[in-house]
């Protein structure tokens, strides 16, 4: 009786079980009554990650320079290369086949985490007692400036976007 | 038990040609992918061909792609190497080579080797 | 297509471990996990040691151990044996159209 299903690495084909190539090799030829499966190692720039029936093996993928990309991890006989972006630049998605220039906080806004080659920088706004008054991809949120520390007294409030303005204290109040 | 036999070695004159035969026993030799192995004397090994287990799939060095073929009688039990244009950088011991499974890019098993000389 | 490196000779004394290095290229080593070693004893056949980088075939004592790392293969012998004097040959698939290439072999010599 022929089998209707195969074992686990085991692929069913002219009603035979034939070994699976493993990752890393092509099928040449499904085995037979006689003969074991054959298989290939992929060549050069080539690929397969599991083990496989493919008659061809899938290319690297290219780290294209013009696109912003650069080689994170070469690839191997058994894994795809991993593209990663230029410094300044991060991936528009999780296969990164594109790169964008990281996003710049706005004033009020501070740098909450810093962009990497794989995320875009993270804002948040500056809470109540801290400004940012720059356009930057780093900075975070400064403390406002403490007047008391210095002697001196606050003349102008701060907001998210300023610093406040220390004076001296007016000499005539007792 | 396995064993391979190689046999057909000898002197050749150089642009010559000889055949060697490996006779297989112990194992469903149709199964296995074989190669073949050669030492030049006094030095390392150098693989020179390989065949799968049918036949149909054959692969060669470089150093012999042209000038040798090899095939297999699986009815025989037997790998062949056709040598054909044979140079002096040709002489050495050649191994039969079991491949490990499908894989001849492993040899789990050899023969005890067939001098090949090439010399005038 | 050039052989992968070994050193030409190693040494140890019994029950020491020794390492045998075997580099080569991302086209050889580096891209492919098909990295076997070969003991070959004066005037005698090649005998697997080690297939697919660290896998040993039945019959083959534990004390032979395989490992890689980038394009570096490394044999290790721990528990050194008289028997383990033999030259050895590392031997990997590589994507140039000569498809096997061996290392040149390193003689390992046990002291004493």
């Known amino acids: 009786e022929p089998p209707t299903a195969c074992r686990e690495k085991q692929y069913l084909i002219n009603s035979q079980c034939c070994s699976l190539c493993q990752p890393g090799q092509k099928l040449v030829s499904d085995c037979t009554e006689f003969t074991e499966t054959e298989c290939l190692p992929c060549g050069e720039s080539e690929f397969l990650d599991t083990w496989n029936r493919e008659t061809r093996c899938h290319q690297h993928k290219y780290c294209d320079p013009n696109l912003g990309l650069r080689v994170q991890q070469k690839g191997t006989s058994e894994t795809d290369t991993i593209c990663t972006c230029e410094e300044g630049l991060h991936c528009t998605s999780e296969s990164c086949e594109s790169c964008v220039p990281h996003r710049s906080c706005l004033p009020g806004f501070g740098v909450k985490q810093i962009a990497t080659g794989v995320s875009d920088t993270i804002c948040e706004p500056c809470p109540v007692g801290f400004f940012s008054n720059v356009s930057s991809a780093f900075e975070k949120c400064r403390p406002w400036t403490s007047c008391e520390t210095k002697d001196l007294v606050v003349q102008q409030a701060g907001t998210n976007k300023t610093d406040v303005v220390c004076g001296p204290q007016d000499r005539q109040r007792a | 038990e396995v064993q391979l036999l190689e046999s057909g070695g000898g002197l050749v004159q150089p642009g010559g040609s000889l055949r060697l035969s490996c006779a297989a026993s112990g194992f469903t030799f149709s199964r296995n992918a074989m190669s073949w192995v050669r030492q030049a004397p006094g030095k390392g090994l150098e693989w020179v061909s390989a065949?799968?287990?049918?036949?149909?799939?054959?692969y060669y060095a470089d150093s012999v792609k042209g000038r040798f073929t090899i095939s297999r009688d699986n009815s025989k039990n037997t790998l062949y190497l056709q040598m054909n244009s044979l140079r002096a950088e040709d002489t050495a011991v050649y191994y039969c080579?079991?491949?490990?499974?499908?894989?001849?890019?492993?040899?789990?098993?050899w023969g005890q080797g067939t001098l090949v000389t090439v010399s005038s | 297509q050039s052989a992968l490196t070994q050193p030409a000779s190693v040494s140890g004394s019994p029950g020491q471990s020794i390492t045998i290095s075997c580099t080569g290229t991302?086209?050889?080593?580096?891209?492919?996990?098909?990295v076997s070693w070969y003991q070959q004893h004066p005037g005698k056949a090649p005998k697997l040691m080690i297939f697919e980088v660290n896998q040993r075939p039945s019959g083959v004592s534990n004390r032979f151990s395989g490992s890689k790392s980038g394009t570096t293969a490394s044999l290790t012998i721990s528990g050194l044996q008289a028997a383990d004097e033999a030259d050895y040959f590392c031997?990997?698939?590589?994507?140039?159209?000569?498809?096997?290439?061996f290392g040149g072999g390193t003689k390992l010599t046990v002291l004493g």
């Open positions: 991302s086209s050889d080593v580096g891209n492919y996990n098909l």
């Open positions: 080579a079991r491949g490990y499974s499908n894989s001849w890019w492993y040899f789990d098993y």
């Open positions: 065949t799968g287990g049918s036949g149909i799939s054959t």
């Open positions: 031997c990997s698939y590589t994507t140039s159209s000569t498809y096997v290439i």
